[in-house]
């Protein structure tokens, strides 16, 4: 009995439905079919859980998180024992692994090995400024997603025709800051966060207006 | 034929560990469910947990979770169940078991049973 | 977590009758129901499994049936050697759990 080489890894958008293979060949007819697929979840590496199991003809649930959600990807017996869950969480991202055993058929690689990466695209990011608005000040553009992965890249534009940052500005990408310096009447304007990751993107908009100093009264 | 040896008897102070091995013999190791079942005298039989070997990992029922910790090692082929944090109420025959199959389902395969005794 | 409900907690019968042990489920098991003999000082042996399949070497007087929730061991002519303790076990819902048993005892 062989268990072939997966691909390595999976990778799926949350709330889809992930495939992760599995098949193997073999010289004995499919009479006695075992397949078992654990998953050690990425988030508690030291609780292993149990997938979902055939044995004697039968399906068993694994764990109560799989239930309703996993079945193998085929009708079985088969040499294809690939199985999809459905409705892909976050904790569902781990390294699962196909255990395989076929009586009499005995030696060679019975386990078969691949990750699961479920994806999250950022949640919408809040837009925040930090230091004073009085013309001469430093400011600081905030920008943070509570949710994303791959972690977001942020991008800051300035919503003008030119879609540039002032040139005293210095930005970011990965803490998601821009930092203006010295601030003038045209760093004044709306400016847009665009939080990314390889699956989706989201923005929010803030707007900085300079406050210049009034003039004093005699 | 598989064969199950467990551990002899074992006498412990509460609050102290215990650990049982269970060595088994004609049959592969490494891909099948060794389980571990209690029993208290006069009482019941009640699934603690598992392990195959070969994922090296195992699964608890959730009232032993963090108390008890089940681990194999593929060279010798022993299971080992180790319970901490002992009481007079964890005083019972501690058998292994072993299913046809990879998971825990039902057990065609018996260890002879040890005896742990928790008494101060 | 899965009850099993093993009624009576005690049946007395004399050899070559009938034995009807009754298991009963909190939740549905499908047909994944084993059954365990039992001797004092002994381990668990296993009788059947999927409710009805008999285990390797199992004599034909012992049988079972049932599924969903209602489960029954019948041993249809009691010999000397079967007074035990038979106790059932469900595996499709975690933790796996077995039934507090029922002493089949001489009459």
């Known amino acids: 009995l062989e268990v072939s080489e997966s691909p390595g890894s999976v990778q799926v958008a949350r709330g889809q439905t992930a495939v992760l293979p599995c098949a193997f060949s073999t010289s004995a007819a499919l009479l006695n079919l075992n397949v078992i697929w654990m998953v050690i979840p990425l988030s508690n590496a030291n609780q292993p859980e149990q997938v979902i199991l055939y044995q004697g003809g039968q399906m068993f649930d694994g764990a109560l998180r799989f239930h309703g959600r996993v079945g193998f990807t085929g009708t079985m017996p088969a040499t294809n024992v690939s199985i999809f869950i459905n409705n892909t969480q976050l904790s569902d991202t781990g390294t699962y692994q196909c255990l395989v055993n076929n009586l009499p058929d005995r030696g060679g690689r019975n386990i078969g090995v691949t990750g699961l990466t479920v994806l999250v695209p950022p949640s919408a990011p809040q837009c925040q400024i930090q230091g004073s608005q009085d013309l001469g000040s430093d400011v600081i553009l905030l920008c943070s997603s509570e949710e994303g992965i791959p972690r977001p890249t942020y991008l800051w534009e300035k919503l003008d025709n030119t879609l540039k940052l002032p040139p005293t500005a210095t930005q970011d990408q990965v803490q998601g800051t821009v930092t203006i310096r010295n601030i003038s009447a045209l760093s004044s304007g709306l400016y847009q966060c665009v939080a990314s990751n390889a699956i989706g993107t989201s923005t929010c908009l803030l707007d900085l207006q300079v406050i210049s100093p009034q003039p004093r009264s005699v | 034929q598989v064969q199950l040896v467990q551990s002899g008897a074992e006498v412990k102070k509460p609050g102290s560990s215990v650990k049982v091995s269970c060595k088994a013999s004609?049959?592969?190791?490494?891909?099948?469910?060794i389980s571990w079942v209690r029993q208290a005298p006069g009482q019941g039989l009640e699934w603690m947990g598992g392990?195959?070997?070969?994922?090296?990992?195992?699964n608890y029922a959730q009232k032993f979770q963090g108390r008890v910790t089940i681990t194999a090692d593929e060279s010798t082929s022993t299971a080992y169940m180790e319970l901490s944090s002992l009481r007079s109420e964890d005083t019972a025959v501690y058998y292994c078991?072993?299913?046809?199959?990879?998971?825990?389902?039902?057990?065609?395969?018996w260890g002879q049973g040890t005896l742990v005794t928790v008494s101060s | 977590e899965t009850t099993l409900t093993q009624s009576p907690a005690t049946l007395s019968v004399s050899p070559g009758e009938r034995a009807t042990l009754s298991c009963r489920a909190s939740?549905?098991?499908?047909?994944?129901i084993a059954w365990y003999q039992q001797k004092p000082g002994q381990a668990p042996r296993l009788l059947i499994y999927?409710?009805?399949t008999r285990a390797t070497g199992i004599p034909a007087r012992f049988s079972g049936s049932g599924s969903g929730t209602e489960f029954t061991l019948t041993i249809s002519s009691l010999q000397s050697e079967d007074f035990a303790v038979y106790s059932c076990?469900?595996?499709?819902?975690?933790?796996?759990?077995f039934g507090q048993g029922t002493k089949v005892e001489i009459k």
């Open positions: 392990i195959i070997p070969i994922f090296g990992t195992a």
């Open positions: 999927d409710s009805s």
């Open positions: 076990q469900q595996y499709k819902n975690w933790p796996r759990t």
């Open positions: 078991a072993r299913g046809r199959g990879f998971g825990e389902l039902y057990f065609d395969y």
């Open positions: 939740q549905g098991v499908r047909s994944n």
């Open positions: 004609g049959g592969t190791f490494s891909s099948y469910a």
